[in-house]
């Protein structure tokens, strides 16, 4: 019997999407590239439920983790990597006093129980997101033996 598995190995399913929490660290731009290499996107948050899920993953592992949000295009104007602006209701997730742009901090990370802005050239963990496979279609992903992970091989 073939079991349907909506996400590749080592990815986590949540509300119709697959998420990969990296085990290595890269700067923000390289994190974008790493996600693109596996057909995903550095995570763009669309709902409070998704934010709560991701914040929990990040805080549980006690890691500073990049998300797909920056104000690189225009200082103070935060934009997701899909081009959409940071919406009003998501501003509540910034940690107290953030974003503060101390020393050109233009990229957003999960930090503790909220978000922080930090220097984009710093190496941090990252989260990729892509749509889950539908189990009713031909291209469904059945427990593949080859994990698709956007991590470089160990040195």
């Amino acid at each position: 019997e073939r079991l349907c598995h909506p996400c590749p190995w080592e990815w986590t399913f949540f509300q119709g999407n697959c998420y990969f929490m990296s085990n290595s660290q890269r700067n923000w731009h390289d994190s974008i590239t790493a996600c693109k290499e596996v057909g995903a996107q550095l995570v763009v948050i669309k709902s409070a439920e998704e934010q709560n899920f991701l914040q929990l993953q990040s805080s549980r592992s006690n890691r500073f983790t990049w998300m797909g949000l920056s104000d690189l295009n225009q200082e103070g104007t935060w934009q997701w990597v899909d081009g959409s602006p940071l919406l009003p209701s998501f501003k509540q997730y910034w940690n107290r006093g953030e974003p503060n742009n101390v020393g050109e901090e233009d990229c957003a990370e999960f930090s503790g129980n909220g978000w922080n802005d930090d220097k984009c050239n710093l190496a941090k963990f990252w989260i990729c997101k892509k749509s889950a496979a539908s189990c009713s279609r031909d291209e469904e992903q059945f427990l593949s033996p080859a994990p698709a992970t956007p991590n470089p091989p160990p040195a």
């Epitope: 999407n17 763009v44 669309k46 998704e50 919406l87 009003p88 209701s89 509540q92």
Partner: antibody, heavy 119, light 112 residues
């Protein structure tokens, strides 16, 4: 009790600039999480979102009308102002202001003001 | 043409159950953005009926319920009453348009 009230001209001529004022009470636009939006509805047609301003003074505009719209706020007067340039008869509509609290739902609306564009 | 597609009209007899669909795409409902529903009685401003997919503001009867799945959402009204006759609009956010979007509206007629 949250209330919003729109005011402005009932009639404008083509090519003129429309200025609408939303005066509200029962909440403050300096409170985190609060936003005010403008939405319009041509006679017998659907609702169309135009612009939004939040407590942080960040402004959001409809892509198709961005070049014609300006939204601003006067927190001390509890007012939000929308200006729309180069008015055309197709802009004839009822214009509403509405509050948006968290989660992006418009939870309180003004009664609307009808604006006719005609020469 | 609205970004969110609703049937132009639905009807039902008093006491019946009707549903109104709202179909979007991967850049709005399918992306995970919340869906809200509004009721607009004739000659009045819209009123929030359902927020965040399935929640009712205080004062809205439990005859009204909302749900969301994939790229679509739906509003269900049970025990239809004459005063439910109105236009109903769904609303979400669209990341491609970078703006809030409404459905084209559905006119509910209560028969009899």
């Amino acid at each position: 009790q949250v209330t919003l009230r729109e005011s402005g001209p009932a009639l404008v001529k083509p090519t003129q600039t429309l200025t609408l004022t939303c005066t509200f009470s029962g909440f403050s636009l300096s409170t985190s999480g609060m936003s005010v939006s403008w939405i319009r509805q041509p006679p017998g047609k659907a609702l169309e979102w135009l612009a939004l301003i939040d407590w942080d003074d960040d402004k959001y505009y409809s892509t198709s009308l961005k070049t014609r719209l300006t939204i601003s706020k006067d927190t001390s007067k509890n007012q939000v102002v929308l200006t729309m340039t180069n008015m055309d008869p197709v802009d004839t509509a009822t214009y509403y202001c509405a509050r948006m609290a968290l989660r992006h739902a418009f939870d309180a609306w003004g009664q609307g003001t009808m604006v006719t564009v005609s020469s | 043409q609205s970004v969110l597609t609703q049937p132009p009209s639905v009807s039902g007899a008093p006491g019946q159950r009707v549903t109104i669909s709202c179909t979007g795409s991967s850049s709005n409902i399918g992306a995970g953005y919340d869906v809200h529903w509004y009721q607009q009685l004739p000659g009045t401003a819209p009123k929030l009926l359902i927020y965040v997919n399935s929640n009712r503001p205080s004062g809205v009867p439990d005859r009204f319920s909302g749900s969301k799945s994939g790229t679509s959402a739906s509003l269900a009204i049970t025990g239809l009453q004459a005063e439910d006759e109105a236009d109903y609009y769904c609303q979400s956010y669209d990341s491609s348009l970078s703006g809030w979007v409404f459905g084209g509206g559905t006119k509910l007629t209560v028969l009899g």
